[in-house]
């Protein structure tokens, strides 16, 4: 069971990143699915290595004081959402903006029907060029 | 099937990074090989988690306007080369240069004879000290 | 065999990061253990994908000239310690400090009784908020 999906620009104002089965994507079988273009949902309980990579372009003056944060989050049926992993990068002083990349990854137990998704502080800063931003998992 | 190879400084002017089976490297068996010191080639079709880490040292004034970009690329026999993953980091203002690290990783389907390699915008900026820059894969 | 442990603030002045089985941690079975809150020790020989993520907050003026470096290290019974992976990030000019994240990961052969741990140049700069700093491995 494995998946690798590709970032998709979105007009939605949500902080949850959007993904698509496009480009050189992976969706090994129907035991993992991309739901509503925003979350990877697994049918089987087990240990999964889950990862995300986010490239963004921001400028210190044009952004809030707070850093750019990417969060890998988990939603299991009947449970509260929780943050699995987070990474933070202070905005660049480069103009008009400076690109930076964040990589998240870790091993987590997922229940049947559990979904994982990626949140960022400012989705408008995310880079969607080929290979820059992606999200995936593999069952151990 | 797994491999982990270590960066090697090169006098070549190519943007493709050079690697060696040295230090604490891994080459599990002959189903994955390091070819010409530049690409990992697999003999078996399947899903692989492929990763690369690149540490580099650059300075904004001494570098081009463009960010430092590391790309994980795929070459399958008779197919076009393609970018699987990319990461970008704006150059530091630290002098003489500021170090930064990039990590790339994802799950991809590889065909028999497929090769993966790592491209960077400026190989002269890459750090080759112990553990700083490496490249590997594992078959799921 | 898999583990994922969560960073823990420590009053110790050691450069070795401290970890705990808390939050959404993983410890698949007793073939991998967290020892003294500082190292993951495996009982079985084999290939392991080992990873660490460290988020830190630093300021160029308040820090040494040297960059912030995170190192993934190996200690095998009767062998010298060795660095497996390192990543470096120059300190931010943001005030009071600028957050940055480092991700390390690679495939390594571990012997029975081998331990892996994470070293940083300045543990006081490490961010311990939910999901920011973690450490784990999985057996291939």
């Amino acid at each position: 069971i494995a998946a690798h999906v590709i970032s998709e620009a979105s007009s939605k104002t949500t902080s949850v990143l959007q993904w698509a089965e496009k480009g050189y994507y992976t969706m090994s079988n129907n035991l993992v699915t991309l739901e509503n273009g925003k979350q990877l949902t697994v049918k089987r309980q087990g240990l999964y290595y889950i990862y995300a990579q986010v490239t963004f372009c921001s400028n210190r003056e044009a952004s809030s004081q707070a850093p750019f944060i990417a969060s890998l989050c988990l939603k299991s049926p009947g449970r509260f959402e929780r943050i699995l992993l987070r990474a933070a990068n202070t905005h660049s002083s480069a103009k008009p903006c400076g690109q930076q990349s964040i990589h998240l990854g870790g091993v987590f137990e997922l229940q049947p029907g559990a979904s994982v998704f990626v949140n960022v502080t400012d989705p408008s800063q995310v880079s969607h060029g080929t290979g820059f931003t992606s999200f995936g998992l593999l069952k151990l | 099937i797994a491999a982990h190879v270590i960066s090697e400084a090169s006098s070549k002017t190519t943007s493709v990074l050079q690697w060696a089976e040295k230090g604490y490297y891994t080459m599990s068996n002959n189903l994955v090989t390091l070819e010409n010191g530049k690409q990992l080639t697999v003999k078996r079709q399947g899903l692989y988690y492929i990763y690369a880490q690149v540490t580099f040292c650059s300075n904004r004034e001494a570098s081009s306007q463009a960010p430092f970009i590391a790309s994980l690329c795929l070459k399958s026999p008779g197919r076009f080369e393609r970018i699987l993953l990319r990461a970008a980091n704006t150059h530091s203002s630290a002098k003489p240069c500021g170090q930064q690290s990039i990590h790339l990783g994802g799950v991809f389907e590889l065909q028999p004879g497929a090769s993966v390699f790592v491209n960077v915008t400026d190989p002269s900026q890459v750090s080759h000290g112990t553990g700083f820059t490496s490249f590997g894969l594992l078959k799921l | 065999i898999a583990a994922h442990v969560i960073s823990e603030a420590s009053s110790k002045t050691t450069s070795v990061l401290q970890w705990a089985e808390k939050g959404y941690y993983t410890m698949s079975n007793n073939l991998v253990t967290l020892e003294n809150g500082k190292q993951l020790t495996v009982k079985r020989q084999g290939l392991y994908y080992i990873y660490a993520q460290v988020t830190f907050c630093s300021n160029r003026e308040a820090s040494s000239q040297a960059p912030f470096i995170a190192s993934l290290c190996l200690k095998s019974p009767g062998r010298f310690e060795r660095i497996l992976l390192r990543a470096a990030n120059t300190h931010s000019s943001a005030k009071p400090c600028g957050q940055q994240s480092i991700h390390l990961g690679g495939v390594f052969e571990l012997q029975p009784g081998a331990s892996v741990f994470v070293n940083v140049t300045d543990p006081s700069q490490v961010s311990h908020g939910t999901g920011f700093t973690s450490f784990g491995l999985l057996k291939l």
Partner: antibody
Framework: EVPLVESGGGLVQPGRSMKLSCVAS????????MAWVRQAPKKGLEWVAS????????YYGDSVKGRFTVSRDIAKSTLYLQMHSLKSEDTAIYYC?????????????WGQGVMVTVS | DIQMTQSPTSLSASLGETVSIECLAG??????LAWYQQKSGGSPQLLIY???RLQDGVPSRFSGSGSGTRYSLKISGMRPEDEADYFC?????????FGSGTKLELK
């Protein structure tokens, strides 16, 4: 709006050279492979050449290898085809096309085409 | 080079009729195949990719099927605007090759 517009065609004598251009708009040019495909009068389609994202890799059909060169200018979002030693059998409509980003690299956008007559 | 043999060379169909065009590859191309439509005086347009996936904006009366070396394009219910030349193409390996085309006319 057509995102690919070719120019530079016309009549040329055998053995001479000609350069075609294709200006792209509406997408990030460096994120896609680009290609030239031709169609001789009343004939089928023939792939001529393709070029990678930023131009580091080029690929050619057997009939033009060594005579034609594909290149691109990222800053100008322009694709080029430099044709040397032209032959009468190179007479065709030349289309600029974008490869999609799927594993198959299909042609998802085509220009209107430009006529090259070698006579 | 992978040879692509397309048939028939031409056919005519009545309004509402179902039409099939075949493409035979010289070797297994693992579904890495596209179908294009080219109307008179126009540029080719992508209809089907990956053997059976419909390109965005293409009417659902077009469908693709097949595997290995044999592929087909089906038009379920011929319409006047479907009068065109149709080409298959393999991108499994370069050099990329096209079928010789099928001219579809309205009866």
């Amino acid at each position: 709006e057509v995102p690919l517009v070719e120019s530079g065609g016309g009549l040329v004598q055998p053995g001479r050279s000609m350069k075609l251009s294709c200006v792209a708009s509406g997408f990030t040019f460096s994120d896609y492979y680009m290609a030239w495909v031709r169609q001789a009068p009343k004939k089928g389609l023939e792939w001529v050449a393709s070029i990678s994202y930023e131009g580091s890799s080029t690929y050619y059909g057997d009939s033009v290898k060594g005579r034609f060169t594909v290149s691109r200018d990222i800053a100008k979002s322009t694709l080029y085809l430099q044709m040397h030693s032209l032959k009468s059998e190179d007479t065709a409509i030349y289309y600029c096309a974008r490869h999609d980003d799927s594993p198959g690299y299909y042609f998802d956008y085509w220009g209107q085409g430009v006529m090259v007559t070698v006579s | 080079d992978i040879q692509m043999t397309q048939s028939p060379t031409s056919l005519s169909a009545s309004l509402g009729e179902t039409v099939s065009i075949e493409c035979l590859a010289g070797e297994d191309i693992s579904n890495v195949l596209a179908w294009y439509q080219q109307k008179s005086g126009g540029s080719p347009q992508l209809l089907i990719y990956a053997a059976n996936r419909l390109q965005d904006g293409v009417p659902s009366r077009f469908s693709g099927s097949g595997s290995g070396t044999r592929y087909s394009l089906k038009i379920s219910g011929m319409r006047p605007e479907d009068e065109a030349d149709y080409f298959c193409q393999q991108t499994f390996r370069y050099p990329l090759t096209f079928g010789s085309g099928t001219k579809l006319e309205l009866k």
